[in-house]
Amino acid sequence: SSPCPQAWGPPGVQYGQPGRSVKLCCPGVTAGDPVSWFRDGEPKLLQGPDSGLGHELVLAQADSTDEGTYICQTLDGALGGTVTLQLGYPPARPVVSCQAADYENFSCTWSPSQISGLPTRYLTSYRKKTVLGADSQRRSPSTGPWPCPQDPLGAARCVVHGAEFWSQYRINVTEVNPLGASTRLLDVSLQSILRPDPPQGLRVESVPGYPRRLRASWTYPASWPCQPHFLLKFRLQYRPAQHPAWSTVEPAGLEEVITDAVAGLPHAVRVSARDFLDAGTWSTWSPEAWGTPSTGTIPKEIPAWGQLHTQPEVEPQVDSPAPPRPSLQPHPRLLDHRDSVEQVAVLA
C-alpha cells in the first residue's frame, strides 16, 4: 500500500504552502524505500536515493516555480509514480450569512474570507440551541447536529427546512481543503433573519371618474406559507413620472386607493412586505407597476339624506408614512382608509 496519505482532492496531487518546507511523497513504493526524484520534463536529478529521506522529496521554502509534476523512481529505475505539487493556503473561516423568506425555512450562504488557491469544499450543519438545566451537560439528541443540505451544482448555499420560528439555531460552516479545515459558527433566530420576498402581482388601475385616484392591488409572495397565524403587513410607495421623491403609505390589506395622484400623469407604484409583528426586516421592493388616473369628471353624488356637493380632491400631505397597521387576514379586500377624508361632503 502507498506510504502517502491521500489528501482530499484529485488523485496524484499533493499540496503545500508557499514559503514553507514541502514534503512530496512517492506513492508507488514502500515507506522508507530510497527513491530518485525528477521534475517532469527536466532530466537533472533533484534528489537522489542517497539523500537519507527515503520516499520523500523535501523542497525548502517552496514557491510558485516549484509547482508542477514530479517523477519518483526506485533504485533500479522503476517508476514509483508521478506527483503534482500545488501550492496554496489553509482555509480561513468562511463568511456566512443566513436569511429566511418565510417563517418555516431559512437558508445560509457562505464565501471564503481568503482565497486558498486549492480545491475547497464546505461542510454544513446546524443544531437547535436549547437552554439546558445546570445539572445537564449532555446535548439532547433532538437538538442535532443535522446536515444542512447544500444546493446542487456547487451553489454556496444550504437550506434548513421545517425550522421553528421561536428557536435559536447554531449554523456550522466548515471550509475544508487539503491543508486543513476552518469553522465559522453563526447563531441565528428566524425572527431576526426573516425577510419576506416582495409582494407579487402588483397592479395599478385608474378609478373611473376620479382623476386623482389610483387603485393598487397585490398578492402575498408565493414563498409565504398560507397559514393564518403569521401575516404580513405592507408598505406602498408611489410617485408621478419624473418626480424624484416617493410618497409612502402602509395599507391595511392587499389593496390601496391613492387619493392624491397628479391628474393626467403616469405613476410608478411599488410595494414591500414585512412580518406583521415586525420580526426581521422589510422585503425588497416589488418591481414597479405603472398606472395613470382616469381623465373623466367627478360625478355629482346625491345621497339619500340630502343634496351634497363633493369637495374637489385636495392633495393631502403624505410625506410621512401612516402608523403601521397589520393585515389581519391573508387576503382581505378593504376600502381605502382615507376615502372618508377625501369624499367629505358638505350640505348645500
Epitope: S36, F38, E42, P43, K44, L45, G48, I71, Q73, D76, G77, A78, L79
Partner: antibody, heavy 117, light 107 residues
Framework: QVQLQQPGAELVRPGSSVKLSCKAS????????MHWLKQRPVQGLEWIGN????????HYNQKFKDKATLTVDKSSSTAYMQLNSLTSEDSAVYYC??????????WGQGTLVTVSA | DIVLTQSPATLSLSPGERATLSCRAS??????LHWYQQKSHEAPRLLIK???QSISGIPARFSGSGSGTDFTLSFSSLETEDFAVYFC?????????FGQGTKLEIK
C-alpha cells in the same frame, strides 16, 4: 532476466519508412522508460528520445522530432520506433534501452538499418 | 545542447596498470554524469551513475569522480576485459548527450 529483443537488420529504400521493434521480457513493461539511441561509427551515440510505457508520454531530441515516432503496445510488451523519409544519413545501428528517466540500464542488441537503393 | 568532450581519444595501456579517463562538459552539470562501456559488436553497459555512484554487478576497480564540468573514470588495475570504448553521458538537460568516446586499447 531482463531481455530486449530487436531484429538484427533492416534494408530499406531511400524515401521510405521503417518501423523498428523492441520486445521486452523479464520485467513489468509499464514500470520503466524505454529509450531509443542511434550509433554511427564517426558520430558516436545519439539519444533519440524516450517513452513511458504506462502513459505513452514521450521526450524527443529535437534533432529527431520529425524523423522518429515512438510508440508502445502494452499488450505485447513491445516498443516501436518508426523512422520516416529515410536517407543515407539514417543508416546506423539503432538500440532500444530500458532505463529510468535518463539512464540506460539494459540494452537491446541493436538493429542495423541500411538505407540503400 | 550540452557538449561532452572526452580525452584522450585513445589510451594505450597494459593490464595491471592504473587508468584515468576524462570527460569535460560545456557547462556545469552538477553530478548528472554517467559512464558506459562498449565492447566491439556489443551494446553499451552502464558502469557509473551520477558521477560516482557504483552500479550493481560492476567490479569495484571502476570508480568515478568529479562535479560541475570535470569528471573522471578511474581503473585501479586494468584487466584484459576492460579494453573497450568508454562513453560519458549527461542528464542535466535535454537532449541527453554523449561524449565521442575514449578507446582504451592494449599497449
Amino acid at each position: 532476466q531482463v531481455q530486449l529483443q530487436q531484429p538484427g537488420a533492416e534494408l530499406v529504400r531511400p524515401g521510405s519508412s521503417v518501423k523498428l521493434s523492441c520486445k521486452a521480457s523479464g520485467y513489468t513493461f509499464t514500470n520503466y522508460w524505454m529509450h531509443w539511441l542511434k550509433q554511427r561509427p564517426v558520430q558516436g551515440l545519439e539519444w533519440i528520445g524516450n517513452i513511458g510505457p504506462s502513459d505513452s508520454k514521450t521526450h524527443y531530441n529535437q534533432k529527431f522530432k520529425d524523423k522518429a515516432t515512438l510508440t508502445v503496445d502494452k499488450s505485447s510488451s513491445t516498443a516501436y520506433m518508426q523512422l520516416n523519409s529515410l536517407t543515407s544519413e539514417d543508416s546506423a545501428v539503432y538500440y532500444c534501452a530500458r532505463g529510468d528517466y535518463v539512464l540506460f540500464t539494459y540494452w537491446g542488441q541493436g538493429t542495423l538499418v541500411t538505407v540503400s537503393a | 545542447d550540452i557538449v561532452l568532450t572526452q580525452s584522450p581519444a585513445t589510451l594505450s595501456l597494459s593490464p595491471g596498470e592504473r587508468a584515468t579517463l576524462s570527460c569535460r562538459a560545456s557547462q556545469s552539470i552538477s553530478n548528472n554524469l554517467h559512464w558506459y562501456q562498449q565492447k566491439s559488436h556489443e551494446a553499451p553497459r552502464l558502469l557509473i551513475k551520477y558521477a560516482s555512484q557504483s552500479i550493481s554487478g560492476i567490479p569495484a576497480r571502476f570508480s568515478g569522480s568529479g562535479s560541475g564540468t570535470d569528471f573522471t573514470l578511474s581503473f585501479s588495475s586494468l584487466e584484459t576485459e576492460d579494453f573497450a570504448v568508454y562513453f560519458c553521458q549527461q542528464s542535466y538537460s535535454w537532449p541527453l548527450t554523449f561524449g565521442q568516446g575514449t578507446k582504451l586499447e592494449i599497449k
